[in-house]
Each structure stands twice: as structure tokens, then as C-alpha cells.
Interface confidence: low
């Protein structure tokens, strides 16, 4: 009688499309890109942490989010050399089961943590610009820190499947040791569930919130400019809003599309080895795009602020932070910020948006 899923050893079988995603140029190009991302990311995000924590003394809601964004990126970046070696060795995993689980969870964790943090940052920008007075009590350092703890817990929860189901397997007829998900062939709910969760929870919902937040900011600022027709219009703010939304969208959309195609393959809707090859070949490339842009996010958001830019350049010139806390750092704003007095509904003031992680 049928005995399904009784092979409990670490041996597994190679498949119908054994060459899918296995190309010499991938084994050279991807490790090279991973190495570049690692160097640039570690350097950039470490400086962001130093600037926000030591120079700017972590005084604003947005700086809390940006600091956590940089820390999440650093957690991911530390595992990137393992993936570079794994790809260079033609998907052979030499680091053991424990590091397989940790490295896999790190990738998943970074995706969710960074996307959730960017979503919260967009909500914070909306509250700061559109409702600066009303949101003052809500936009506190305590709320920001609790929000970050919740985000880390949620990202950790989303990474649990990787910790549980990612394992090192020896593929019998090809003599390859891989770090991969495994699940019963007759029960593909795990890969489908993980893929769709990544699509919906890791992209669709956050993108809709980010889009809504910045659209409402856009409308509020447009309204403010219309009230003061005699004042010169500053189009930079609108360009920055567009840049934020488009940067997020185009960073993640390739990876999300191929993740969805991957789900269709798991479901058996796509049954073509050529498409499987395209998906498996493109996947690491889309990971490079998404995670490289992701690692640039703290710099991208930070450099929108004059103070951040100044401290960052100061740090590059080895100028140490002042021992005394900066008195001119107010707790009100951050990226895409207004002075508290510059309520957009006020017709007496000129909207003076400045993109600061103050």
C-alpha cells in the first residue's frame, strides 16, 4: 500500500528540470553582485546607524524607523557572503543546517521588516504633514519604539517557516547538497502560502498604504500651494514623493512577479521547463535588485534631510559627534517634514516642506 512521505532521511530526488536556473554566468554574476551589495550595504548602513544614533541622538520618530531599517539591512547583509558562496558553488551549501536556517530566515526577515518599516514611515510622514497638530500626541518616541518592536516580532513570525522548513539536503543522483525548502509533493500549500504571503503581505498591502499615504500628502501640499497662489511653487517635494513611491515599486515588483510565477509553477499551472528556467535564472537577479535597493533605502531616505547629509559627510571626514546633545534637534519631524507651525491647512503660512530626519 502507498506509503507517502516516509522517507525521513536527508536524501531527496532531482527533478524534471535539473538544469533550471543553473547557468555558468549566474554562478559568476550573482556572487559578484552579492559581493558589491555586501560592501556597499555594510558601509552605507553602518554609517547610517552611526549618524542617526551618535550624531543625531535618535530624537525623532522617523529616525527610529530609519535606524531600525538600517539595522534590519545589516542583519541581512551579514548573511550575504554565505549566499554568494552558495551560488558560486553552483547551489552547493557547505555551511551546515544551522546556518542554512539562519541565512534563509534573515532574507525573509529583512523583506518583511524593511517593507513594514517603510510603510510605517509613510504613515508617519502623512500624520506629520497632513495632521501635524492632531498627531502630535500619537507620534511619540515611545509609540515609534513600540511600533518597531511589533514590526520585528511580525517579521520574525513571517520568517518562522524558513527556520522550520529550510534544511540541508543531499540530492542523490546529482551529489549536490542544497539549502532548500522541503515539503510533501502532494501538499504544496507551504510554498504556495509562502509565495502568496510574500506577494500580499510583503508587497501589495504595504504598497497600497505607501501609495495612499503619499497621495494624501501630495493632495494636501497641492491644496496648500493653491491657497497661496502668489508664492513660488516648490516642485522638488512632488518629485521626491514620486521618487519614494516609484523607488519602492520598481525595487520590489520584479521579485514579486517572479515569486508569483514561482507559485504558478508550484501549483502546476505552469508546466514548462523553459519558463521554470527563466524563473529560476531571474530569481537571484531580482533578489539583487530588490535587496540592493533595500539596502540603499536608509541612505536614500536619510539624504533627503539636510542635517543627515551634513552629519553623514562630517562622519566621512572623521569629525566626531559633539558630546552634548544637539539642542536644535526638535522631536517633531523627519523625512518629508513640516515645521509644526506649518499646518498645510493654514492659509497664512507658506508651506515650507523640508525633507529632514531631524
Amino acid at each position: 500500500i502507498l506509503n507517502s512521505s516516509t522517507e525521513d532521511g536527508i536524501k531527496r530526488i532531482q527533478d524534471d528540470c535539473p538544469k533550471a536556473g543553473r547557468h555558468n554566468y549566474i554562478f559568476v554574476m550573482i556572487p559578484t553582485l552579492y559581493s558589491i551589495i555586501f560592501v556597499v550595504g555594510i558601509f552605507g548602513n553602518s554609517l547610517v546607524v552611526i549618524v542617526i544614533y551618535f550624531y543625531m541622538k535618535l530624537k525623532t520618530v522617523a529616525s527610529v524607523f530609519l535606524l531600525n531599517l538600517a539595522l534590519a539591512d545589516l542583519c541581512f547583509l551579514l548573511t550575504l557572503p554565505l549566499w554568494a558562496v552558495y551560488t558560486a558553488m553552483e547551489y552547493r551549501w557547505p555551511f551546515g543546517n544551522y546556518l542554512c536556517k539562519i541565512a534563509s530566515a534573515s532574507v525573509s526577515f529583512n523583506l518583511y521588516a524593511s517593507v513594514f518599516l517603510l510603510t510605517c514611515l509613510s504613515i508617519d510622514r502623512y500624520l506629520a504633514i497632513v495632521h501635524p497638530m492632531k498627531s502630535r500626541l500619537r507620534r511619540t518616541m515611545l509609540v515609534a519604539k513600540v511600533t518597531c518592536i511589533i514590526i520585528w516580532l511580525l517579521a520574525g513570525l513571517a520568517s518562522l517557516p524558513a527556520i522550520i522548513h529550510r534544511n540541508v539536503f543531499f540530492i542523490e543522483n546529482t551529489n549536490i547538497t542544497v539549502c532548500a525548502f522541503h515539503y510533501e509533493s502532494q501538499n504544496s500549500t507551504l510554498p504556495i502560502g509562502l509565495g502568496l504571503t510574500k506577494n500580499i503581505l510583503g508587497f501589495l498591502f504595504p504598497f497600497l498604504i505607501i501609495l495612499t499615504s503619499y497621495t494624501l500628502i501630495w493632495k494636501a501640499l497641492k491644496k496648500a500651494y493653491e491657497i497661496q497662489k502668489n508664492k513660488p511653487r516648490n516642485d522638488d517635494i512632488f518629485k521626491i514623493i514620486m521618487a519614494i513611491v516609484l523607488f519602492f515599486f520598481f525595487s520590489w515588483i520584479p521579485h514579486q512577479i517572479f515569486t508569483f510565477l514561482d507559485v504558478l509553477i508550484q501549483l502546476g499551472i505552469i508546466r514548462d521547463c523553459r519558463i521554470a528556467d527563466i524563473v529560476d535564472t531571474a530569481m537571484p537577479i531580482t533578489i539583487c535588485i530588490a535587496y540592493f535597493n533595500n539596502c540603499l533605502n536608509p541612505l536614500f531616505y536619510g539624504f533627503l534631510g539636510k542635517k543627515f547629509k551634513r552629519y553623514f559627510l562630517q562622519l566621512l571626514k572623521y569629525i566626531p559627534p559633539k558630546a552634548k546633545s544637539h539642542s536644535n534637534l526638535s522631536t517633531k519631524m523627519s523625512t518629508l517634514s513640516y515645521r509644526p507651525s506649518d499646518n498645510v491647512s493654514s492659509s497664512t503660512k507658506k508651506p515650507a516642506p523640508c525633507f529632514e530626519v531631524e
Epitope: D16, C17, P18
Partner: nanobody
């Protein structure tokens, strides 16, 4: 319900031939890659040969050139033609059905038959 049923095993002299058959249920046959594994006494189960839905085949190095795997779609049956048998081919041969369409970086558990004994005497 029996979903994988092997037959054709037996005792054969070294250098002889045998043909193993594996009848699969329609559901499994249409969706899964079919293959043969074997387990000699006191040894681990090892891969012998596999055939995809698209008839792509692969073999263990130890049987290449001697064994041939094929499938008959009309009968939902997979065959393993074993020629030039050696005493070291003595084992219980298992029919296996594994996932229809995983790819190179994702691997799956398998369905197993009950096994059929093949004994090669010298």
C-alpha cells in the same frame, strides 16, 4: 487503495535480464515523475533510474548502459528493463513517484511502493 504496485522481481543468474513493472493510479501517473530505487540488505536506499512526465530520463552511474526505464501511458505503468545483471544488483527494488514539477532548487518527499525482491546469483 494501492497507488503504486511493483511486479517482475525474482531470482536470476548473473548476466541475465529481468523486467520490473510499476502500475500507478491515474492521479499519480499523470502528475508525478516516476522512478526506481533499491535497497540492498544493510545498505541505504539508493536511486536507480527516473523518468519524467515529459519522458526525460536519468540513471545512477552504476546502472547506466545496463538498465532502461520507460513508461506506457496507456497502461499507467513504468518499466525497468535490467540487462547484464550483477550480484551487486541484488536488492529490494522500490517504485517511487515524486513531484510532477519541482525544479532544481526545490525538492520533495515521495510516494513509495512496497518493493519487489531481485536476487542475482553468481
Amino acid at each position: 487503495q494501492v497507488q503504486l504496485q511493483e511486479s517482475g522481481g525474482g531470482l536470476v543468474q548473473a548476466g541475465g535480464s529481468l523486467r520490473l513493472s510499476c502500475a500507478a493510479s491515474d492521479y499519480i501517473y499523470r502528475r508525478y515523475r516516476m522512478g526506481w530505487y533499491r535497497q540492498a540488505p544493510g545498505k541505504e536506499r539508493e536511486f536507480v533510474a527516473g523518468i519524467g512526465v515529459g519522458t526525460t530520463t536519468n540513471y545512477a552511474d552504476s546502472v547506466k548502459g545496463r538498465f532502461t526505464i520507460s513508461r506506457d501511458n496507456a497502461k499507467n505503468t513504468v518499466y525497468l528493463q535490467m540487462n547484464s545483471l550483477k550480484p551487486e544488483d541484488t536488492a529490494v527494488y522500490y517504485c517511487a513517484a515524486y513531484n510532477y514539477f519541482p525544479r532544481s532548487i526545490v525538492y520533495y518527499y515521495v510516494y513509495w511502493g512496497q518493493g519487489t525482491q531481485v536476487t542475482v546469483s553468481s
